[in-house]
Amino acid sequence: APVRSLNCTLRDSQQKSLVMSGPYELKALHLQGQDMEQQVVFSMSFVQGEESNDKIPVALGLKEKNLYLSCVLKDDKPTLQLESVDPKNYPKKKMEKRFVFNKIEINNKLEFESAQFPNWYISTSQAENMPVFLGGTKGGQDITDFTMQFVSS
């Protein structure tokens, strides 16, 4: 069976949108009006992994691009990157663990925990125009809560 995917955008809890910053980086900033068209559209695929009522495993690809968010060790630190893949083979139901995020639903907000590195989350800074990164703390200065907006295909 083919993997199921949905197109969506994400905004952090301060309503910052995610946009491309160079070929392999995302940044978060406030957008308004026509600038909203700059925001990244994700193809969220529902993949194999540990699932519970609050937690659903997903992969986050960039729509119509062969790029996926992935989590790898760089200089011994869990790091978020955009990784290029062969579009003939992706997305797939059994994604490699580095591509898998646990989409956790709490009080109408979403967190995206790395399956590869538990307790590390897709994060944004309070500051404007800063890179989206993998953070190891919740409830601190950095933002780990998001909302999801579905986008028609």
């Epitope: 069976a1 199921r4 949905l6 529902f46 009522n53 609050d54």
Partner: nanobody, 123 residues
Framework: EVQLLESGGGLVQPGGSLRLSCAAS????????MGWVRQAPGKGLEWVSS????????YYADSVKGRFTISRDDSKNTLYLQMNSLRAEDTAVYYC????????????????WGQGTLVTVSS
Amino acid sequence: EVQLLESGGGLVQPGGSLRLSCAASGFTFEDYQMGWVRQAPGKGLEWVSSISAMGNRTYYADSVKGRFTISRDDSKNTLYLQMNSLRAEDTAVYYCAENLVRISKKQWMFDYWGQGTLVTVSS
């Protein structure tokens, strides 16, 4: 043509048990995640349970966890739901769903569903 035919519903007393079946045809059953959703009188659809294509992963709504068991027999193209310790609030039409994928706590995607079987829990 995909067909899903549920059976096994009926009237049962609180605390009783029922086993629902769903006979599937028209697609390669073993390749697909399957599941059950239900609709209580006057309410919306509620996800009940899912089982992975291999049958090695099962998922349950909190409201039925520990009471219901989902299973599948790929040799018979059949999905099952064993319902124990039934309660009045389990009264609903139960639908079998093909390629059921849960996308959030209260949202699902599925390709096909059957006509349903009515379960009534009452004394």
